[in-house]
Amino acid sequence: SERCDDWGLDTMRQIQVFEDEPARIKCPLFEHFLKFNYSTAHSAGLTLIWYWTRQDRDLEEPINFRLPENRISKEKDVLWFRPTLLNDTGNYTCMLRNTTYCSKVAFPLEVVQKDSCFNSPMKLPVHKLYIEYGIQRITCPNVDGYFPSSVKPTITWYMGCYKIQNFNNVIPEGMNLSFLIALISNNGNYTCVVTYPENGRTFHLTRTLTVKVVGSPKNAVPPVIHSPNDHVVYEKEPGEELLIPCTVYFSFLMDSRNEVWWTIDGKKPDDITIDVTINESISHSRTEDETRTQILSIKKVTSEDLKRSYVCHARSAKGEVAKAAKVKQKVPAPRYTVELACGFGAT
């Protein structure tokens, strides 16, 4: 056969679907690789052909579209499973061709099993909710196109294994789940099960996502430097080790680059000709607020080092702060020579 533009295996689309549920998979050619859509291609006389390679096999084979109840079908640029089976796992290829043109792309499809509590190897999207922020909603994802708008599905929401009914601050509202006031206790996995009829059969779509409650932007503040501060003076003798911690609190902020750094005499520590090391530790609160500690250490400090300016800087999307450490040379205690005068005796 004539040459075909082969876009290879598109690993960007690691498609995972649940066993025994409907799945609709669009041919990625029209979404990502070609400059025209399916309708244009079809009008121009191009045909879309599907085939697949089973898991752990090398042999490409045509997809059987003559299964009972049309279990696998194609509609325009969509491959339908009604429903999937475990052994549908494999690499699927869609090829667009006529006598003079050919283009194809493959993508992996994994059919995944779930248990009665919706646990599975499925990669779960994470949805972050702000703590105590007012009403926030999550929406049952990836259910468009499965049934016409005239069909009214039933939607059941679960938190973990439990159906959401009479929860204090979580209210199912069809495809949406509303959190009246999100709290730490709302962290967890939420599942919507969408049930709809089609041609006398009933199908279920299961969608799970992870909710993580994080600090609210209403409460976010610029970084707070707890140390160094005005109450602690780092008083050292030459030859001693100088250790100065910089401890900074950062409010949770979506996509913020939280940073802590030291300058010595206005320069970065690497540019100063002293043997300085900096070690950092990071801890997070339950709402993903962050505390960073950077310890600046000079093993054997010199009197010259004790005259330098050591400043800790911190920056987040909320602002920038800096604080100088109070460093000074320890003044040696005066050495008193006590003379015991014993020579005042009377003669």
Partner: antibody, heavy 119, light 107 residues
Framework: QVQLQESGPGLVKPLGTLSLTCAVS?????????WSWVRQPPGKGLEWIGE???????NYNPSLKSRVTIALDWSKNQFSLQLRSVTAADTAVYYC????????????WGQGTLVTVSS | DIQLTQSPSFLSASVGDRVTISCRAS??????LAWYQQKPGKAPKLLIY???TLQGGVPSRFSGSGSGTTFTLTISSLQPEDFATYYC?????????FGPGTKLEIK
């Protein structure tokens, strides 16, 4: 003295995945630095791809975010770049670099590796 | 994204000349600006960070100034090894962007 060295295939097929590794010697990737990737198409300027902090926190250029992953391998003292679904426009010299926090800039760079996207 | 514009794009000068290269940001970036030198086939080399602080090991003929949106790199007396392309980079806001470069050539 910290040194960075990129490695990976020089030729990647369209729609394939570009995978590069940056080995860090003379220092530890667990130090408080941002380990970054920057690229430069032939005859053009520099483009920041993204970065990873020693803690694992990442930031990516929005223009590439959907296709890129940067990861750390503490055991090998290296970090890596994966760029998926590549096209000819991704042909460039790829540099790994060490950036300090704040305004410190990229003070240590690998020598760069040319990656060509072609079938 | 923050756009950085450099001027001039090309600059011809002689050894011993004093040259200045300008970098302008489309919005304020405080002092979060770095300057790099790049020679053909080589990686960029950091010259200046925090807009005006000289990177360790860089000759003192290089200096930087500016804050906010307008920045300048100055080479006080050009040496033969200074002929290269110079880039500014902002480190204030994601994505970190580079200027288009200024190519410094021997007159």
């Amino acid at each position: 003295q910290v040194q960075l060295q990129e490695s990976g295939p020089g030729l990647v097929k369209p729609l394939g995945t570009l995978s590069l590794t940056c080995a860090v010697s003379g220092g530890s990737i667990s130090n408080s630095n941002w380990w970054s990737w920057v690229r430069q198409p032939p005859g053009k300027g520099l483009e920041w791809i993204g970065e990873i902090y020693h803690s694992g926190s990442t930031n990516y250029n929005p223009s590439l975010k959907s296709r890129v992953t940067i990861a750390l391998d503490w055991s090998k003292n290296q970090f890596s770049l994966q760029l998926r679904s590549v096209t000819a426009a991704d042909t460039a010299v790829y540099y790994c670099a060490r950036y300090g926090s704040g305004p410190f800039g990229g003070d240590c760079w690998g020598q760069g590796t040319l990656v060509t996207v072609s079938s | 994204d923050i756009q950085l514009t450099q001027s001039p794009s090309f600059l011809s000068a002689s050894v011993g000349d004093r040259v200045t290269i300008s970098c302008r940001a489309s919005q304020g970036i405080s002092s979060y600006l770095a300057w790099y030198q790049q020679k053909p086939g080589k990686a960029p080399k950091l010259l200046i960070y925090a807009a005006s602080t000289l990177q360790g090991g860089v000759p003192s003929r290089f200096s930087g100034s500016g804050s906010g949106t307008t920045f300048t790199l100055t080479i006080s007396s050009l040496q033969p090894e200074d002929f290269a392309t110079y880039y500014c980079q902002q480190l204030n806001t994601y994505p970190f962007t580079f200027g288009p470069g200024t190519k410094l050539e021997i007159k």
